[in-house]
């Protein structure tokens, strides 16, 4: 019976460890600045790192600029987006800016896109200052199904701060769906 | 066999509870305003409360102004930093302010510091208004190893809002490293 | 003994699943714009959706404009609040605005309210721009007891963005109290 108990304990420990790891997908994706679109209109950001520096991914997939859910669950999603301008970069087309981020969810089954979270600010970046900076942070708890895709849209992408500590988004699974 | 099963269940329940608690370090540290450094340049904030009001810590250590990781894992890190100025608070020398936060990680083994997250804004705080306020929030999911240290750097520390609901940072472990 | 082991495994799997689900209450509440109070002073927002669109709730209760904790634990709380004004909405009473959010906790036993988190900004929304927008995000990790209530207060509620992706708050349980 002792041996049997040890076996039960062992199999359980194994199962617990395995299920715990399997149950917790995550991703932290950082901006790939080599391919940031220009312009001031709202665009989808498709170039992100998933395996260098702070960027990492597990039990989720990054493909075609989208973070793909592989496992049903409730996830905490977040994004941090930084915009900046220095006078040495040249003049801004306008001093009145709308600096925005939209975290969207796309379902392949129903090919439609929905905004889960948005944030940002209108800004007046006057020429009296040599440097301007602004960051947005959004976060929320959402039910995601396998196959659904998360993507990031921003306005004024040419003003994005390309640092990995500045412009990133991510997700981690918190619990299963009942 | 029933007794044995009860023993298995009991030991498992105990193990599950124990491992669950051990596996989830956390901290929520609030600003200690009695010792905020002066100056406008980027400074490291070293005085935080860990055991009063909303501040708390478990399975992590607070020492020398840094939050020390005691257990390898993936953590969600966050910071909320508020800046404020009232005309009665003191004299501003410039209306143009760079209000920033940097969440940094230091490894003792490799004595180097890296910024995990940054946020903030350039602001124009004119004398036409008697009160000014601005808050920054950042958050992200990071792999942390035992012994690594998390610290907070800000610009314009003398403008920090000293309330516990205003200026704080924290972390909680979400999952083990595979 | 094999049958007994299967029974142990089965009961454990059941217990683990059950306890895991029970241990993780959550809520994501989105603004109900049909009942936003007017004015510019600080008000408590009492109308939120809990079961439509992105809004959802489990093992927590929404009542009288407050999110009620049903289970002791450490929770991550968050809020995203968006303010906006378009010139077609009419003139602003003042160009100098204080756009703020306060996440408060009320204990029924001790009928007092305490602010857990605050964020926001003073803004100068001049008539030179036809559209203004600003978002606040706050988040933090707090110990909550059964029966405690979480509510949201904002300044300038008439400027709130009524979209479900814009103005929301939520919570999810991360771990038990030791």
């Amino acid at each position: 019976i002792r041996a049997e108990k040890a076996m039960v304990d062992g199999s359980w420990l194994d199962l617990a460890k395995r299920s715990k790891l399997e149950a917790q997908p995550f991703a932290h994706l950082t901006i790939n600045a080599t391919d940031i679109p220009s312009g001031s209109h709202k665009v989808s950001l498709s170039s992100w790192y998933h395996d260098r520096g702070w960027a990492k991914i597990s039990n989720m997939t990054f493909s075609n600029g989208k973070l793909i859910v592989n496992q049903d669950g409730f996830y905490y999603l977040y994004a941090n987006i930084c915009f900046r301008h220095h006078e040495t970069s040249g003049d801004l087309a306008t001093e009145y800016l709308q600096l925005m981020v939209y975290v969207t969810k796309t379902s392949i089954k129903i090919p439609s896109s929905h905004t889960l979270m948005k944030g940002g600010s209108t800004k007046y970046w006057s020429g009296n200052s040599e440097f301007h900076f602004y960051s947005i942070n959004v976060g929320g708890f959402f039910k995601l199904r396998s196959g659904e895709e998360i993507s990031i849209e921003v306005s004024n992408p040419s003003l994005l701060d390309p640092d990995q500590d500045a412009t990133y988004f991510g997700a981690f699974k918190v619990r299963d769906i009942d | 066999i029933r007794a044995e099963k009860a023993m298995v269940d009991g030991s498992w329940l105990d193990l599950a509870k124990r491992s669950k608690l051990e596996a989830q370090p956390f901290a929520h540290l609030t600003i200690n305003a009695t010792d905020i450094p002066s100056g406008s340049h980027k400074v490291s904030l070293s005085s935080w409360y860990h055991d009063r009001g909303w501040a708390k810590i478990s399975n992590m250590t607070f020492s020398n102004g840094k939050l020390i990781v005691n257990q390898d894992g993936f953590y969600y890190l966050y910071a909320n930093i508020c800046f404020r100025h009232h005309e009665t608070s003191g004299d501003l020398a410039t209306e143009y302010l760079q209000l920033m936060v940097y969440v940094t990680k230091t490894s003792i083994k490799i004595p180097s510091s890296h910024t995990l997250m940054k946020g903030g804004s350039t602001k124009y705080w004119s004398g036409n208004s008697e009160f000014h306020f601005y808050s920054i929030n950042v958050g992200g999911f990071f792999k942390l190893r035992s012994g690594e240290e998390i610290s907070i750097e800000v610009s314009n520390p003398s403008l920090l809002d000293p309330d516990q609901d205003a200026t704080y940072f924290g972390a909680f472990k979400v999952r083990d490293i595979d | 003994i094999r049958a007994e082991k299967a029974m142990v495994d089965g009961s454990w799997l059941d217990l683990a699943k059950r306890s895991k689900l029970e241990a993780q209450p959550f809520a994501h509440l989105t603004i109900n714009a049909t009942d936003i109070p007017s004015g510019s002073h600080k008000v408590s927002l009492s109308s939120w959706y809990h079961d439509r669109g992105w809004a959802k709730i489990s093992n927590m209760t929404f009542s009288n404009g407050k999110l009620i904790v049903n289970q002791d634990g450490f929770y991550y709380l968050y809020a995203n609040i968006c303010f906006r004004h378009h010139e077609t909405s009419g003139d602003l009473a003042t160009e100098y605005l204080q756009l703020m959010v306060y996440v408060t906790k009320t204990s029924i036993k001790i009928p007092s309210s305490h602010t857990l988190m605050k964020g926001g900004s003073t803004k100068y929304w001049s008539g030179n721009s036809e559209f203004h927008f600003y978002s606040i995000n706050v988040g933090g990790f707090f110990k909550l007891r059964s029966g405690e209530e979480i509510s949201i207060e904002v300044s300038n509620p008439s400027l709130l963005d009524p979209d479900q992706d814009a103005t929301y708050f939520g919570a999810f349980k991360v771990r038990d109290i030791d």
Epitope: - | S38, S40, G90, A93, T94, Y96, S126, G127 | -
Partner: antibody, heavy 121, light 107 residues
């Protein structure tokens, strides 16, 4: 080279007025708060006035409040001090100084050579 | 107003000496104290700010310390060009106030 050059000092009768100027060069004037500091003959230093980089914050000690007016013209990189109702105790070398430390904790990091103001009948 | 009391008001020292000047604030000023050097007929020059930070270009023989109400300026090895008057100043709050000065003379 960062430089501040004061001018406009001289002899004035009690009750009279004088306007001091400070020409700045070698740095972006519009991004710095500026001050006037004075030093009576054989005495210590006394802060007289401060103006923020954009000119919307102005500060004086009680000793000169209501009599002195600080101003700036960022397009001309020039700081001014208009002194009215002058008294004998206002006799001093007046220094123009640049502020560093931005917010509440600012100090004076660059000084001009000073201009002498003598109030006497 | 915060009163800054400097001591001594004057001192005599030789080249190579270690010189210490103290400044006492009438109330807590945290670490917001600056030190200036002034030579006859010249403008003051910033040496130290925020109690212990050396300003750009200031030789490392000059150091500052202290917090709260008690502050010290130390010249580790006095050089001929260091004979001057030294002023402390609190930059904690307005009105900005200076100490009365310490004149360092050749012995």
């Amino acid at each position: 080279e960062v430089q501040l050059v004061e001018s406009g000092g001289g002899l004035v009768q009690p009750g009279g007025s004088l306007r001091l100027s400070c020409a700045a060069s070698g740095f972006t004037f519009s991004r710095y708060g500026m001050s006037w500091v004075r030093q009576a003959p054989g005495k210590g230093l006394e802060w007289v006035s401060t103006i923020s980089s954009g000119g919307s914050y102005i500060y004086y000690p009680d000793s000169v409040k209501g009599r002195f007016t600080i101003s700036r013209d960022n397009s001309k990189n020039t700081l001014y001090l208009q002194m009215n109702s002058l008294r004998a105790e206002d006799t001093a070398v007046y220094y123009c100084a640049r502020l560093d430390g931005y917010n509440y904790r600012w100090y004076f990091d660059v000084w001009g050579q000073g201009t002498m103001v003598t109030v006497s009948s | 107003d915060i009163v800054m009391t400097q001591s001594p008001s004057s001192l005599s020292a030789s080249v190579g000496d270690r010189v210490t000047i103290t400044c006492k604030a009438s109330q807590d000023v945290s670490t917001a104290v600056a030190w200036y050097q002034q030579k006859p007929g010249k403008a003051p020059k910033l040496l130290i700010y925020s109690a212990s930070y050396r300003y750009t270009g200031v030789p490392d023989r000059f150091s500052g310390s202290g917090s709260g109400t008690d502050f010290t300026l130390t010249i580790s090895s006095l050089q001929p060009e260091d004979f001057a008057t030294y002023y402390c100043q609190q930059h904690y709050s307005s009105p900005r106030t200076f100490g009365g000065g310490t004149k360092v003379e050749i012995k």
